[in-house]
């Protein structure tokens, strides 16, 4: 899970986290959070490894608390088959200077 | 610690095939995929496929498409590799590499020649 | 399919330089790009993943940055044993194509 650019520079703008399953996962499903909440959930398609969570401005006022990401796989029978947690993310804005 | 074991080297003739295999140790072979990497001699290197442990879905670069067959054995912790009707363009070194959030564990490497 | 170009494809420096090769995607790929080292007659090896984390193991005068469509490797002090071909790869989507090397030699 990372930040990517364009970084935020206020609370009012918008906000793109990147998360990324290992190899053997192509085409999990992603669910973001934060502070313990579900923000979005995403489908990587099937040729790829990861999804960029897009959160439009003024998602840093949601409830607070680091960014997690959680990937899923349809594993045998059918039964999602979920990862721990991912490192917590941060997201911080420049204090103004006046 | 993890490691992969290759096959040795081997010599082939135009049209022919080689398997390649690759053992793992030190991990849980089901936890992470592979990938096969090649190396011409003096050139770069050239991704031709992954497999997936946990499911066995492959993927393959398109120029290896219908050539080329990854697999997995569980049972003994060993990933395959088939080229077939080889050409002299094929001669390269072939390398396994564990394929998590990139190719953190190579192998050795396994010198394939194509000569006639 | 992606590419990914290198720049340069051969840089001459000397023990001590700060050496600093580009990589470039033909489209997005996030931050999915990873770095590898490759020696004569060996293996490649991982340096960095995740275009700015440094594998483990590897040293601290290595590091990664960018996201995006362009990305880059620097060596903070060079050392004799960083004298190799360095590689960039896209983790983003099939095929996990390779940038072409970028040969690093000593002055």
């Known amino acids: 899970i990372r930040l990517v650019p364009p970084y935020p520079s206020s609370q009012e703008d918008p906000i793109h986290i990147a998360c990324m399953a290992p190899g053997n996962f192509p085409g999990a499903n992603f669910t973001l959070y934060r502070g313990g909440q579900v923000v979005q959930l995403l489908q990587a398609p099937t040729d790829q490894r990861g999804v960029t969570f897009n959160l439009s401005g003024g998602s840093s006022k949601a409830p607070g608390g680091p960014f997690h990401c959680q990937y899923g796989v349809l594993g045998e029978l059918n039964q999602s088959q979920l990862s721990d947690l991912s490192e917590p993310v941060n997201v911080s804005f420049p204090v103004p200077t006046w | 610690q993890m490691q992969l074991v290759q096959s040795g080297a081997e010599v082939k003739k135009p049209g022919a095939s080689v398997k390649v295999s690759c053992k793992a140790s030190?991990?849980?072979?089901?936890?992470?995929?592979f990938s096969w990497v090649r190396q011409a001699p003096g050139l770069g290197l050239e991704w031709m496929g992954w497999?997936?442990?946990?499911?066995?879905?492959?993927k393959y670069e398109q120029k290896f498409q219908g050539r080329v067959t990854l697999t997995t054995d569980s049972s003994t912790n060993t990933a395959y590799m088939e080229l077939r009707s080889l050409r002299s363009d094929d001669t390269a070194v072939y390398y396994c590499?564990?394929?998590?959030?990139?190719?953190?564990?190579w192998g050795q490497g396994t010198m394939v020649t194509v000569s006639s | 399919d992606i590419q990914l170009t290198q720049s340069p494809s051969f840089l001459s420096a000397s023990v001590g330089d700060r050496v600093t090769i580009t990589c470039r995607a033909s489209?997005?790929?996030?931050?999915?790009l990873a770095w590898y080292q490759q020696k004569p007659g060996a293996a490649p090896k991982l340096l960095i993943y995740?275009?700015?984390t440094l594998q483990s193991g590897v040293p601290s005068r290595f590091s990664g940055s960018g996201s995006g469509t362009e990305f880059t490797l620097t060596i903070s002090s060079l050392q004799p044993e960083d004298f190799a071909t360095y590689y960039c790869?896209?983790?983003?989507?099939?095929?996990?194509?390779f940038g072409q090397g970028t040969r690093l030699e000593i002055k």
């Open positions: 590499v564990r394929d998590s959030r990139a190719f953190d564990v």
């Open positions: 030190g991990y849980t072979f089901t936890t992470h995929a």
């Open positions: 497999i997936s442990t946990y499911n066995g879905n492959t």
């Open positions: 489209q997005g790929i996030n931050s999915y």
């Open positions: 995740a275009a700015s």
């Open positions: 790869q896209q983790l983003n989507t099939y095929p996990l194509i």
